[in-house]
Interface confidence: low
């Protein structure tokens, strides 16, 4: 089965620059299929723009100005690229790549879409680092004791643009866990968002990862925030003892950033 | 020119109660085209649901039914038993791939119909309320309540900033909510919730040594441990790939 990945979830440009949007095809040989590009402007219908067929023929939708869009494919990397020249406000949109995928039954085809890349045009000069800054929250003892479950919360702040994807996995597992999230909120010139994961008691002793995709992540890789295992046999103190006032009772965390 | 027009811009549905989306074709006979349905969820993922010829996307056949009403020139998509996973924008689209005549392999889309999912009407359920802290950041977690109307207050004398709460449907078909804030005195922050004309406090759920039943530690358990606010990391974590965390008590 064909699968399309658009590694950039967003692409931020200033006016008149050139944007290059990538689409990686897997499961199908790119030189044996046509790749289509669609655009969804805010509040408008999704519209076909341009396609490149298996033999390299390019077809543009009528009414699309010539010279605006360029499409090509690189068989070696199984990638199709949509280049948007001289970006302007009316190019603000989400761009999807797509292809027709044959089904097992003869004559049945479906068109599958990539996850889309949002083109953002800005005139702001932003701080050098507008990647998401994480803060982690571990389950409260009350929740783990009373509900035999625990909630991890991953807070991400001070990022730009607003396009962000968050998912959760257990360490050493590729299964995406069912999580919940708040809306992305604007704070001054940047954005914040949080996501939370509730796991049953039996999973609290496993390490969990909050995985964040954002245009401005360092080195362009997904950021992984590690949530350490929780010991559920940790027991109660006299509630009158306020451990936060007594350094001997608190847990100190040495936090070391290790890029990999 | 051909146009696909959804019947509604927004369709609220209840969990488990069938819902029907309709999309009419203007300017052409719907029978001359193949109709497709897609769903766009949070994060812009466009997922194929249905195409004429009884083709369904993976995982859609059991809970979705596509149909064409030739007489009314419209396409119909039925969600047989909606769940919270079905929230999103639904698009009808048409093509003439393989129909002969003008070979159009592009899709022509209609505007989306936003499907919002609400829990079924059910007995009222009081929330559980828990506080989570890290540095100046405080999160109030409100779990498993119904109905939706709720006011969440983080109680502090030294507020830096607060954010609007996120209220979502829980996997069990009730609501969960989280409210975040930043406070100079985060250690002393508690959370109180107004729901269904009652007030629920996070302190109601704190584990006490003299509590009874399932809260009481078993005799085999160690009885000395940090209090609930002590197993929170104190620092903000800035990571790229790995956190090396060493714990010292």
């Amino acid at each position: 089965a064909g699968h399309l990945e658009q590694p950039q979830i967003s692409s931020t440009k200033t006016l008149s620059k050139t944007a290059r949007l990538e689409c990686v095809v897997s499961g199908i040989t790119i030189s044996a299929t046509s790749v289509y590009w669609y655009r969804e402007r805010p509040g408008e219908v999704i519209q076909f723009l341009v396609s490149i067929s298996y033999d390299g023929t390019v077809r543009k939708e009528s009414g699309i100005p010539s010279g605006k869009f360029e499409v090509d494919r690189i068989p070696e990397t199984s990638t199709s690229t949509l280049t948007i020249h001289n970006v302007e406000k009316q190019d603000i949109a989400t761009y999807y790549c797509a292809l027709w995928e044959a089904q097992q039954e003869l004559g049945k085809k479906i068109k599958v879409f990539g996850p889309g890349t949002k083109l953002i045009i800005t005139d702001k000069q932003l701080d050098a680092d507008v990647s998401p800054k994480p803060t982690i929250f571990l389950p409260s003892i009350a929740e783990t004791k009373l509900q035999k479950a625990g909630t991890y919360l991953c807070l991400l702040e001070k990022f730009f643009p607003d396009v962000i994807k968050i998912h959760w996995q257990e360490k050493k597992s590729n299964t995406i866990l069912g999580s919940q999230e708040g809306n992305t909120m604007k704070t001054n010139d940047t954005y914040m968002k949080f996501s939370w994961l509730t796991v049953p008691e039996k999973s609290l002793d496993k390490e969990h990862r909050c995985i964040v995709r954002h245009e401005n992540n360092k080195n362009g890789v997904d950021q992984e925030i590690i949530f350490p295992p929780i010991k559920t046999d940790v027991i109660t103190m006299d509630p009158k003892d306020n451990c936060s006032k007594d350094a001997n009772d608190t847990l100190l965390l040495q936090l070391t950033n290790t890029s990999a | 020119a051909i146009e696909l027009v959804p019947e509604h811009q927004t369709v609220p549905v209840s969990i488990g109660v069938p819902a029907t989306l309709r999309c009419s074709m203007k300017g052409e006979a719907i029978g001359n085209y193949y109709i497709n349905w897609y769903r766009k969820t949070q994060g812009n993922t466009m997922t194929f649901i249905y195409r004429e010829k009884d083709i369904y996307g993976p995982g859609f056949k059991d809970n979705f039914q596509g149909d064409i009403d030739i007489a009314k020139n419209l396409a119909v998509l039925k969600i047989l038993a909606p769940s919270e996973r079905d929230e999103g924008s639904y698009y009808c689209a048409c093509d003439t791939l393989g129909m002969g005549g003008e070979y159009t392999d592009k899709l022509i889309f209609g505007k989306g119909t936003r499907v919002t999912v609400e829990p079924r009407s059910q007995p009222h359920t009081k929330p559980s309320v828990f506080v989570m802290k890290n540095g100046t950041n405080v999160a109030c977690l409100v779990k498993e309540f119904y109905p939706k109307d709720i006011r969440i207050n983080l109680v502090s004398s030294k507020k830096i900033t607060e954010f609007d709460p996120a209220i979502v449907i829980s996997p069990s078909g009730k609501y969960n909510a989280v409210k975040l804030g930043k406070y100079e005195d985060s250690n002393s922050v508690t959370c109180s919730v107004q729901h269904d004309n009652k007030t629920v406090h996070s302190t109601d759920f704190e584990v006490k040594t003299d509590s009874t039943d399932h809260v009481k530690p078993k005799e085999t358990e160690n009885t000395k441990q940090p209090s609930k606010s002590c197993h929170k990391p104190k620092a903000i974590v800035h990571t790229e790939k790995v956190n090396m965390m060493s714990l010292t008590v």
């Epitope: - | 109660v17 039914q65 149909d67 009403d69 007489a71 119909v76 047989l80 079924r120």
Partner: antibody, heavy 121, light 112 residues
Framework: QVQLVQSGAEVKKPGSSVKVSCKAS????????INWVRQAPGQGLEWMGG????????NYAQKFQDRVTITADKSTNTAYMELSSLRSEDTAVFYC??????????????WGQGTLVTVSS | DIVMTQTPLSSPVTLGQPASISCRSS???????????LSWLQQRPGQPPRLLIY???NRFSGVPDRFSGSGAGTDFTLNISRVEADDVGVYYC?????????FGGGTKVEIK
């Protein structure tokens, strides 16, 4: 326009069975409930049971449970009601009716023309 | 089973005058999903029944606005604001909240 067309009138002997058909056209057959309703001469309406073809399983009124079988053929958009062990008091007009937009719960929005079954020795 | 009781059994009315039919259920018709699945049907002489009102008060497509439904819980009413000759027939209430689906005994509307 949705239409439900039923098979013709039948005369049956006591103890025998009758199978009435109901062919749907002009709408989606699969996802609506097709119900069967009995109306004895000069009497009111009585629900016998119904089926949602998509799911394939039928629901029956207790009174008819042992004698009625409701089926659906998705390929021909046709529903069937078979009533066995007929007795004279089964003489009635049998209607098929489509449940509304959510299976059973709208009420019955479209009705067949009715099939008169006469049970007589 | 839910028993549906209609009153009156028969209602002679003058053309142009209003008519009202009552339907009472033996238990609440509020479904666990919050909806109330009570509908009204009209059966003209020699014809199959026809849906007028669904979910208490929603008029089915093509039904004149002189027909209206109201009620809640266990008590429901069908109103005809100005009776026309065409309205002669038997009117049934029906519940689809719980299996088995059940009908009222019917109310005959005739012209005086």
């Amino acid at each position: 326009q949705v239409q439900l067309v039923q098979s013709g009138a039948e005369v049956k002997k006591p103890g025998s069975s009758v199978k009435v058909s109901c062919k749907a056209s002009g709408g989606t057959f699969n996802i609506y409930a097709i119900n069967w309703v009995r109306q004895a001469p000069g009497q009111g309406l009585e629900w016998m049971g119904g089926i949602i073809p998509f799911f394939g399983t039928a629901n029956y009124a207790q009174k008819f449970q042992d004698r009625v079988t409701i089926t659906a053929d998705k390929s021909t958009n046709t529903a069937y009601m078979e009533l066995s062990s007929l007795r004279s008091e089964d003489t009635a007009v049998f209607y098929c009716a489509r449940g509304g937009d959510s299976g059973y719960d709208w009420g019955f929005d479209y009705w067949g023309q009715g099939t008169l079954v006469t049970v007589s020795s | 089973d839910i028993v549906m009781t209609q009153t009156p059994l028969s209602s002679p009315v003058t053309l142009g005058q209003p008519a009202s039919i009552s339907c009472r259920s033996s238990q609440s018709l509020v479904h666990s999903d919050g909806n109330t699945y009570l509908s009204w049907l009209q059966q003209r002489p020699g014809q199959p029944p026809r849906l007028l009102i669904y979910q208490i008060s929603n008029r089915f497509s093509g039904v004149p606005d002189r027909f209206s439904g109201s009620g809640a819980g266990t008590d429901f009413t069908l109103n005809i604001s100005r009776v026309e000759a065409d309205d002669v027939g038997v009117y049934y209430c029906m519940q689809a909240t719980q299996f088995p689906l059940t009908f009222g005994g019917g109310t005959k509307v005739e012209i005086k």
